[in-house]
Interface confidence: low
């Protein structure tokens, strides 16, 4: 799997999970989240050559097409596969609220 | 929806469905498929600015992050959303076989 266990341990130009820390205030302009101040969102990036973690038959076809026609703009893209939620603390007035924001953390990637 | 009805009618630089005809023999080197000779596979391409058909909370966060940090390599990518199968005819020896290849045709796109 193109997850932290594999991607953070190997230097990989192809599609893989990349570390990304997001500071809510600085990076998103969000001032409403009290805790945490930021989080390890991660992201997916890298090339999708033929048969590199292809998600569907179409992405396999597209990567093969791209190998034979590399000048074409049609190629699969490295995107998130498994995502996890993030628990945040924010305030409505003086009342603290705890909420789980779904699909905030990328855990693994795929070529789609 | 970023489908043919919208994308093929509008000139759109952002993430959208793009027409792509694939000739099995010429573009993939596949000689085993007897019919059809090729098919409209389509593909997804284009920019994913903030809130443009974002698939998940993470892709919304990433596009906002990318707006504030445009030099960063972390940004959502335009990928297939809905896919359809393709029915093909091939031969095993002299015996014709009809099979449905799943997820071969892209019908719509999303920013993921």
């Amino acid at each position: 799997a193109l997850d932290a266990a594999y991607c953070f341990r190997n230097v990989q130009d192809n599609c893989c999970l990349r570390p990304l820390y997001i500071d809510f205030k600085r990076d998103l302009g969000w001032k409403w989240i009290h805790e945490p101040k930021g989080y390890n969102a991660n992201f997916c990036a890298g090339a999708c050559p033929y048969l590199w973690s292809s998600d569907t038959q179409h992405s396999r076809v597209l990567s093969l097409y791209n190998t034979i026609n590399p000048e074409a703009s049609a190629s699969p893209c490295c995107v998130s596969q498994d995502l996890e939620p993030l628990t945040i603390l924010y305030y409505i007035g003086k009342t603290p609220k705890i909420e789980q924001l779904s699909n905030m953390i990328v855990k693994s990637c795929k070529c789609s | 929806a970023l489908d043919a009805a919208y994308c093929f009618r509008n000139v759109q630089d952002n993430c959208c469905l793009r027409p792509l005809y694939i000739d099995f023999k010429r573009d993939l080197g596949w000689k085993w498929i007897h019919e059809p000779k090729g098919y409209n596979a389509n593909f997804c391409a284009g920019a994913c600015p903030y809130l443009w058909s974002s698939d998940t909370q993470h892709s919304r966060v990433l596009s906002l992050y990318n707006t504030i940090n445009p030099e960063a390599s972390a940004s959502p990518c335009c990928v297939s959303q809905d896919l359809e199968p393709l029915t093909i005819l091939y031969y095993i020896g002299k015996t014709p076989k009809i099979e449905q290849l799943s997820n071969m045709i892209v019908k719509s796109c999303k920013c993921s």
């Epitope: 130009d13 192809n14 990036a45 890298g46 090339a47 999708c48 050559p49 033929y50 990567s63 791209n66 190998t67 034979i68 026609n69 590399p70 000048e71 074409a72 703009s73 190629s75 893209c77 490295c78 | 000739d23 010429r26 391409a45 390599s73 940004s75 990518c77």
Partner: antibody, heavy 125, light 112 residues
Framework: EQQLVESGGGLVQPGGSLRLSCAVS????????VNWVRQAPGKGLEWIGY???????YYASWANGRFTISKDSAKNSVYLQMNSLRAEDTAVYFC???????????????????WGPGTLVTVSS | DAVLTQTPLSSPVTLGQPASISCQSS????????LSWFQQRPGQPPRLLIY???TLTSGVPDRFSGSGAGTDFTLKISRVEAEDVGVYYC????????????FGGGTKVEIK
């Protein structure tokens, strides 16, 4: 910095062979397609062929058969093997990478960038 | 195979004045926009100016612009500067052609 540097050029007799090397740095050959382009003295540019990141080589129709492109990703090098050389093959030979848009191979559009400085091949007796 | 014809062969221009180079392809370039423009100064390798018919490469001055689609393309320099002297080449990308790429014959831009 992403760079390409050609080597192996020089004087060769007609009918002879020569292997040019293109050493790349700052990027991986598993993610990028590399082209060979030549330029005869005082003439225009002529595309020879490329080797894709997937390892497939393609050639201009005139180059097919006499010219072979290969690569060694571990050595970060692309090669151009030239056989049965003729006087008209005298040229500066460049290697050039396919540009990528947005960090993925999403369309090079005949866009070659960056280029190496070139290496001169002279075919003469 | 495709042939790219550039006109004029030579273009003597006054400093500060505009210059225009035409590039005509014997067949449509792939996707109607797979055309690039290169500048080559004496003793140097070519430098990519424009790709996708009209997209300026990073670091290229905005006095350069590209236009056109299909078979007819134009490179314009709005105000020629001394550093613009050199030979300009167009290059097209083609699909289903035995020659994937073709270069134009070049146009020499010099100061009057």
């Amino acid at each position: 910095e992403q760079q390409l540097v050609e080597s192996g050029g020089g004087l060769v007799q007609p009918g002879g062979s020569l292997r040019l090397s293109c050493a790349v740095s700052g990027f991986s050959l598993s993610s990028y397609t590399v082209n060979w382009v030549r330029q005869a003295p005082g003439k225009g540019l002529e595309w020879i062929g490329y080797i894709s990141y997937g390892g497939s080589a393609y050639y201009a129709s005139w180059a097919n058969g006499r010219f072979t492109i290969s690569k060694d990703s571990a050595k970060n090098s692309v090669y151009l093997q030239m056989n049965s050389l003729r006087a008209e093959d005298t040229a500066v030979y460049f290697c050039a990478r396919h540009m990528q848009v947005g960090g993925a191979p999403t369309g090079s559009m005949a866009a070659f960038d960056p280029w190496g400085p070139g290496t001169l091949v002279t075919v003469s007796s | 195979d495709a042939v790219l014809t550039q006109t004029p062969l030579s273009s003597p221009v006054t400093l500060g004045q505009p210059a225009s180079i035409s590039c005509q392809s014997s067949q449509s370039v792939y996707n109607n926009n797979y055309l690039s423009w290169f500048q080559q100064r004496p003793g140097q390798p070519p430098r990519l100016l424009i790709y996708g018919a009209s997209t300026l490469t990073s670091g290229v001055p905005d006095r350069f612009s590209g236009s056109g689609a299909g078979t007819d393309f134009t490179l314009k320099i709005s105000r020629v500067e001394a550093e613009d002297v050199g030979v300009y080449y167009c290059a097209g990308g083609y699909s289903g052609s035995s020659d994937k790429y073709a270069f134009g014959g070049g146009t020499k831009v010099e100061i009057k």
